[in-house]
Interface confidence: low
């Protein structure tokens, strides 16, 4: 049956999916609060730009029937559920927010002939890779994997002369939805990042994780986890690790290293951690005093997903453009707009681009440094400490194999 | 090598003006923050005003409205216009720059932080304000 699109003649809405099974654990109202936040921000501005329409917001609720385990893993069918929803109501936005989940997002593609724009804060995986309507505003595995190909590759930075070709990756599948992806996107025999290694194994019990540390017949230096300091201790411990052993901890959503007084622990010395650069505005708005620093940014991307969707209106408004065309739903991409906290950049499949920061700990001062920024968007990696004070043999990154000299 | 050197220091009577300049050499990043640090005898260095590539602009809240950051490109120098100085304004004012910048928030951010790790800094310039 037709669904008509609450999109024309002044009055333009954004369809939000509120479902349980959500990227992060974040109550739903905070997720209200953001799109509210945006909403002002985006009547606003198009105020001032002499376009007297109204925008709104129609937040549709999954009633849980059918999964209700709050995980992503279990979300395949409650996209469709919802829009089973909307197609029963007769009534949608002119651009769908939601859902954050690889599963929903991914099956809702399969499913649907989606004609209109999907923003999702999430949907890390490498199967909502190219999507022509979806955009996400979360870093997406693919960008994950670039990163790492091109600082294994990189061999000319005074603190890292060696290319690396090789890696472990521990992967226990307790994850939460952006490292599981993530770390899939690595495990993945036919990603970007397996096809440039030469060596590259799996761990999947904690055991295995351990015997690594201080194995003299290890494959490779070189292990990639997914989480936050935390976690590493619960797996680590204060157990002993080899000299030459580096530890890479994706932990891309979570702002604590650039807090104040925050000190890294001992057992932090052999890890790099791969993180974002903070915002800033979110700290003191009305929305996100309750935030942890982790779901500051799944908040900040449904609320730059409305800004989005207000800069999009605003473009075809004064273009005098009609926004239920197929124009409509694939120009939500290659483009930069005004974020909540400055510009924002969209690839050309519609990805948001961000600089990502490589730490590492002091031991001069047991404070987190930033060692180096990538940036996304052009695939290009800046060093900003020239003289690190690491833990590793001569203020250098080790070789990812060992060299035992004749056996 | 990046070198940072400031210049335009100096003694001031309270309500007067005074203009920094920061003159950097070998610096190629094409993203960048980079402002003015200060460091009042006794106490923790702590950020005035900054500015990245974007052009995004932070200060301090205790000197808004009364110092204004800006840069000229073409002379590889940075400015920090200060009027309506008050006697705590005395401290050695360092020019500070790193290569880091996301969307100019990790510049801002710098702002709220006691002692900001930037990568690279100047030698400092003494301005006093008394009377």
């Known amino acids: 049956s037709q669904v008509s699109q609450n999109c024309h003649n002044g009055s333009y809405e954004i369809s939000v999916l509120m479902m349980d099974n959500s990227a992060f654990a974040e109550p739903l109202e905070n997720v209200e609060d953001a799109v509210n936040e945006g909403l002002e921000i985006v009547r606003g501005r198009l105020q001032n730009a002499g376009l007297n329409v109204t925008v709104n917001a129609s937040f549709m609720y999954s009633d849980g029937l059918i999964h209700n385990s709050g995980d992503c893993r279990s979300s395949t069918c409650e996209g469709l559920d919802l829009l089973r929803k909307i197609s029963n109501a007769k009534r949608m936005g002119c651009v769908l927010m939601g859902p954050s989940c690889t599963y929903s997002t991914f099956q809702m593609y399969l499913d649907t002939e989606l004609s209109y724009p999907m923003i999702s804060a999430g949907s890390f995986g490498l199967s909502c890779d190219y999507k022509e309507t979806l955009t996400r505003l979360m870093s997406p595995a693919r960008k994950l994997t670039y990163f790492l190909v091109n600082f294994w590759k990189t061999n000319d930075l005074p603190f890292k002369t060696y290319s690396w070709s090789t890696s472990y990756v521990y992967k226990n599948g307790t994850e939460s939805e952006d490292c599981f992806w993530y770390l899939n996107a690595l495990e993945a025999s036919v990603s970007y990042f397996s096809h440039e290694l030469s060596f590259k194994l799996v761990l999947r019990q904690d055991k295995e994780f351990q015997d690594i540390l201080m194995d003299h017949n290890r494959k490779s230096n070189v292990i990639v986890m997914c989480g936050g300091p935390e976690f590493l201790y619960k797996l680590k411990g204060d157990r002993a690790v080899a000299e030459d052993i580096v530890i890479i901890l994706v932990d891309l959503f979570n702002d604590q290293y650039f807090e104040d007084n925050v000190t890294a622990p001992d057992y932090m010395k052999n890890v790099l951690v791969l993180t974002q650069s903070p915002g800033n505005s979110l700290l003191n708005s009305s929305f996100s005093r309750n935030l942890s620093p982790t779901k500051r940014d799944f908040a900040l991307a449904y609320l730059n997903g409305i800004l989005l969707f207000g800069h999009m209106l605003k473009t075809f408004l004064e273009n005098g453009e009609n926004i239920t065309t197929p124009k409509f739903a694939h120009a939500f991409r290659n483009l930069t707009f005004e974020g909540y906290d400055g510009p924002v950049t969209l690839d050309d499949w519609g990805d948001v681009d961000s600089t990502m920061v490589l730490l590492y700990t002091s031991v001069d001062t047991k404070k987190y440094k930033v060692l180096l920024t990538y940036d996304t968007h052009v695939n290009q990696t800046n060093p900003v400490d020239m003289s690190p004070t690491f833990t590793w043999k001569n203020s250098k990154l080790p070789n990812d194999i060992t060299d035992r000299g004749p056996q | 090598e990046v070198q940072l050197v400031e210049s335009g220091g100096g003694v001031v009577q309270p309500g007067g003006s005074l203009r920094l300049s920061c003159a950097a050499s070998?610096?190629?990043?094409?993203?960048?923050?980079m402002g003015w640090v200060r460091q009042a005898p006794g106490k923790e260095r702590e950020g005035v005003a900054l500015?990245?590539?974007?052009?995004?602009?932070t200060y301090a809240d205790s000197v808004k409205g009364r110092f204004t950051i800006s840069q000229d490109n073409s002379k590889n120098t940075l400015y920090l216009q200060m009027n309506s100085l008050r006697a705590e304004d005395t401290a050695v004012y360092y020019c500070?720059?790193?290569?880091?910048?996301?969307?100019?928030?990790?510049?801002?951010?710098?702002?709220?932080?006691?002692?900001?790790?930037?990568?690279?800094w100047g030698q400092g310039t003494l301005v006093t304000v008394s009377s």
């Open positions: 500070a720059a790193d290569a880091v910048n996301w969307y100019g928030s990790i510049c801002a951010s710098m702002i709220r932080r006691k002692n900001p790790a930037f990568g690279y």
């Open positions: 500015i990245a590539s974007d052009g995004t602009t």
């Open positions: 070998g610096y190629t990043y094409s993203r960048y923050c």
